[in-house]
Amino acid sequence: IWELKKDVYVVELDWYPDAPGEMVVLTCDTPEEDGITWTLDQSSEVLGSGKTLTIQVKEFGDAGQYTCHKGGEVLSHSLLLLHKKEDGIWSTDILKDQKEPKNKTFLRCEAKNYSGRFTCWWLTTISTDLTFSVKSSRGSSDPQGVTCGAATLSAERVRGDNKEYEYSVECQEDSACPAAEESLPIEVMVDAVHKLKYENYTSSFFIRDIIKPDPPKNLQLKPLKNSRQVEVSWEYPDTWSTPHSYFSLTFCVQVQGKSKREKKDRVFTDKTSATVICRKNASISVRAQDRYYSSSWSEWASVPCS
Amino acid sequence: RNLPVATPDPGMFPCLHHSQNLLRAVSNMLQKARQTLEFYPCTSEEIDHEDITKDKTSTVEACLPLELTKNESCLNSRETSFITNGSCLASRKTSFMMALCLSSIYEDLKMYQVEFKTMNAKLLMDPKRQIFLDQNMLAVIDELMQALNFNSETVPQKSSLEEPDFYKTKIKLCILLHAFRIRAVTIDRVMSYLNAS
């Protein structure tokens, strides 16, 4: 058993049929010695008396808010949560495996630039009685500070018969130099509590590996005389690290119809303009990627050919 | 500690091309190592990230773009002094700081070159003959060093009398390649910045 936060404790259980469970001793936070009784949740049934209560925790029915009273007055609470371990593996029931970029990916993180700010998100099908707490650091043995905000519900989607909820959090490394060469990864830890179930999820990464620029901005087309070709130009996204001559981007320019199966024109360039063939009912799209360290491409920025 | 914006004349920067070749060569070599050593811990997640130039050169700090010198997190650097005559400098007016930056890059390359050559000598003794360093990568390191054209003491190649542990050597190769790739990215960014300035 260990303390998650004040008056909230996590009991780690090996979860298998007829498991013996864990013996837990609860102590009432009071100077009083006599006349103390214990109850669980809203029940008025007295579980025991005295300053301490010893319980055998085997299942979720044994978890919950234990309260010690004296003469009708509440003295203190202890909330017990269960953390299940099945076949030596901690449970991951609360969050959905996003399977990208590999299996068992519960947290996904992205950064728009090298400033040390990044966003992580996760998915769940659970809609109520759910709380998240996020901590982060650079390195684990001698951790350097990363400050994370509160996790918020950022999107709701319908997936077949199920509703899927996306939560996200923004974090900022306390003293980040955009030009630095990272040797210690960022660690992100998410505590998830659903009703009386506790789970924790972690992710470890270098900012350089989670870079995904915003789409290029200000796409403009200029038809070329006596030609099927048009010159398309754009600018670096505002959120990208500066100076741009140091933090350079490379671009992919594509002309395609509405369907992905349609034929296309495609060209890659380090410049902020390119010449492509425009077709009726097609659109020109441009996306960006770090020129020197190939992490993710940005989303597409698009303009119609016409 | 930083690079002034008004540096060489346009088109006078022969090192950009070599630095691009360097990044390409080390990326290819790293990819080859990951594929060939697929049963060794050779991915970014599996290896320890070591920097053999740590406390010996200060490339990131010495080559910091002017725009980032306002960022206090970028300025907790070590002071290091270097020789200041290089052919990539392209103009008499070149600042001391730029010379410091380029000589730091030169020292990085020299250190990695020695490490890679020592390692290759060991790998050539491996009866499995599983992986060797790409001669193209070694040649590209050499070309960039020549383009930088700094006079510097030659570092003797490390020789080892004990029987090499080939497993450890291959792990070390992965560690070196990952670190060198990161440094090659920094070098490419610096050369691009200087070329645009």
Epitope: R228, Q229, T250, R261, E262, K263, K264, D265, R266, V267, F268, T269, D270, T275, I277, R279, K280 | -
Partner: antibody, heavy 118, light 107 residues
Amino acid sequence: QVQLVQSGAEVKKPGASVKVSCKASGYAFTDYYLHWVRQAPGQGLEWMGWIDPENGDTEYAPKFQGRVTMTTDTSTSTAYMELRSLRSDDTAVYYCNANKELRYFDVWGQGTMVTVSS
Amino acid sequence: EIVMTQSPATLSVSPGERATLSCRAPQSISINLHWYQQKPGQAPRLLIYFASQSISGIPARFSGSGSGTEFTLTISSLQSEDFAVYYCQQSNSFPLTFGGGTKVEIK
């Protein structure tokens, strides 16, 4: 599968014209760009131009501008390349090729030998 | 137009050996570079597109790398069926142009 079958070999006199055909099968004809590339005996490859069968748009290499015409007949899924004012250095194998991407060549025809000789 | 230069013109290699073919552009063409193989009496065949992207059905011993002005096609271990002429082609701008070719012959 995608296939391109070209017309047979031709022998032409200098100053004449030649029209080579290329019949496509195995895909929706208007879904791919069609290019023509030629290769003189013992020489390299030379791009001549492309046509979009969907709308008849064309782009020709400057070297052939005014001397070449590329057309398509969607009813028969056939592309044509006509080269006029033939010279002896137009002696080459002419290839048609198709791709969903405009700028490189995925599927090639077997080639048509055109000999220009007096 | 962009004139592509391939080297060497002829490469003599023993079966099982590694072959490295080079293609140069006079200006940066990013990764707009494609490789073809042509055997005598046959049409060319696409091997690699956009400098390093492999084509399904093409053996894994063929790999491409490079960007900007210098590109490489590597055949890791030459098989008898790989002796042919190899062409690079730029797609950075029209007109599309090919290199002069590299003939890979048996040593």
